[in-house]
């Protein structure tokens, strides 16, 4: 399936007071990632 976003890197965003980077979660919760779930494991982040 086409995957517009390459999910190898994580962490575009950071909001003070939040426990995680927004972009980390955004990538994990993107349409592109949802299409890949169950087909390949999450690649490790560097």
């Amino acid at each position: 399936l086409a995957d517009p976003l390459d999910h190898r890197d994580a962490g575009d965003l950071w909001f003070p007071g939040e426990s995680e980077s927004f972009e980390d979660a955004h990538v994990e919760h993107s349409i592109s990632r949802s299409l890949l779930e169950g087909e390949i494991p999450f690649p490790p982040t560097s």
């Epitope: 979660a25 955004h26 919760h29 993107s30 592109s32 949802s34 299409l35």
Partner: antibody, heavy 114, light 112 residues
Framework: EVQLVETGGSLVQPGKSLKLTCATS????????MHWVRQSPEKQLEWIAH??????????YYAESVKGRFTISRDDSKTTIYLQMNSLKEADTAIYYC?????WGQGVMVTVSS | DTVLTQAPLSVSVTPGESASISCRSN???????????LYWYLQKPGKSPQLLIY???NLASGVPDRFSGSGSETDFTLKISEVETEDVGVYYC?????????FGPGTKLELK
């Protein structure tokens, strides 16, 4: 095939309300964070609202221009997101897109005019 | 707010030649882990925006490699190495680093 289909646009008078619907298909919906972005007649794109997933307590975020007037929501069982728009202003006239920022719907026109 | 400005606002290119579009941010778009949150979209006439470049320099799936993105923390460039007819439309930069998310005003690309 990923599909995002917006409906509910129309011509409304200032001060009135309107509810937009974005029906999605072709991908597992419940874990996806969704957004509404609008495009003014001058073609400027403006992000207006964002809703997270159930695991994030359906947290929502809004642009100042719509905060207190617009409400984004979702129904995971129907794989659908909504945008309830109240106290509409002429400045809200735009094409409204639902998007995951990677995939976009075709858009729906909302015209606010007396 | 994070304000994005683009230049030029309109560009006319001969097919086969290269084109460059600039996007400047009033704030750094460098996030944690050295990820730069600058995205490029193309909106073809009568269509919805489509993702071209994410995180400043990464090509989205299905996008021809004649498109490339580069830049620093506040200054960014989209380059099209050999413009084709299908590249006509309005190019927008966007940032997803800070709320509210913002888009540039767009650059209209036309063919000579």
């Amino acid at each position: 095939e990923v599909q995002l289909v917006e409906t509910g646009g129309s011509l409304v008078q200032p001060g009135k309300s309107l509810k937009l619907t974005c029906a999605t298909s072709g991908f597992p919906f419940s874990n996806v964070w969704m957004h509404w972005v609008r495009q003014s007649p001058e073609k400027q794109l403006e992000w207006i609202a964002h809703i997270k997933a159930k695991s994030d307590n359906y947290a929502t975020y809004y642009a100042e221009s719509v905060k207190g007037r617009f409400t984004i929501s979702r129904d995971d069982s129907k794989t659908t997101i909504y945008l309830q728009m109240n106290s509409l202003k002429e400045a809200d006239t735009a094409i409204y897109y639902c998007t995951g920022l990677d995939y976009w719907g075709q858009g729906v026109m909302v015209t606010v005019s007396s | 707010d994070t304000v994005l400005t683009q230049a030029p606002l309109s560009v006319s290119v001969t097919p086969g030649e290269s084109a460059s579009i600039s996007c400047r941010s009033n704030k750094s778009l460098l996030g944690i882990r050295d990820i730069t949150s600058l995205y490029w979209y193309l909106q073809k006439p009568g269509k919805s925006p489509q993702l071209l470049i994410y995180r400043m320099s990464n090509l989205a799936s299905g996008v021809p490699d004649r498109f490339s993105g580069s830049g620093s923390e506040t200054d960014f460039t989209l380059k099209i190495s050999e413009v084709e007819t299908e590249d006509v439309g309005v190019y927008y930069c966007a940032q997803f680093l800070r709320y509210p998310y913002t888009f540039g005003p767009g650059t209209k690309l036309e063919l000579k």
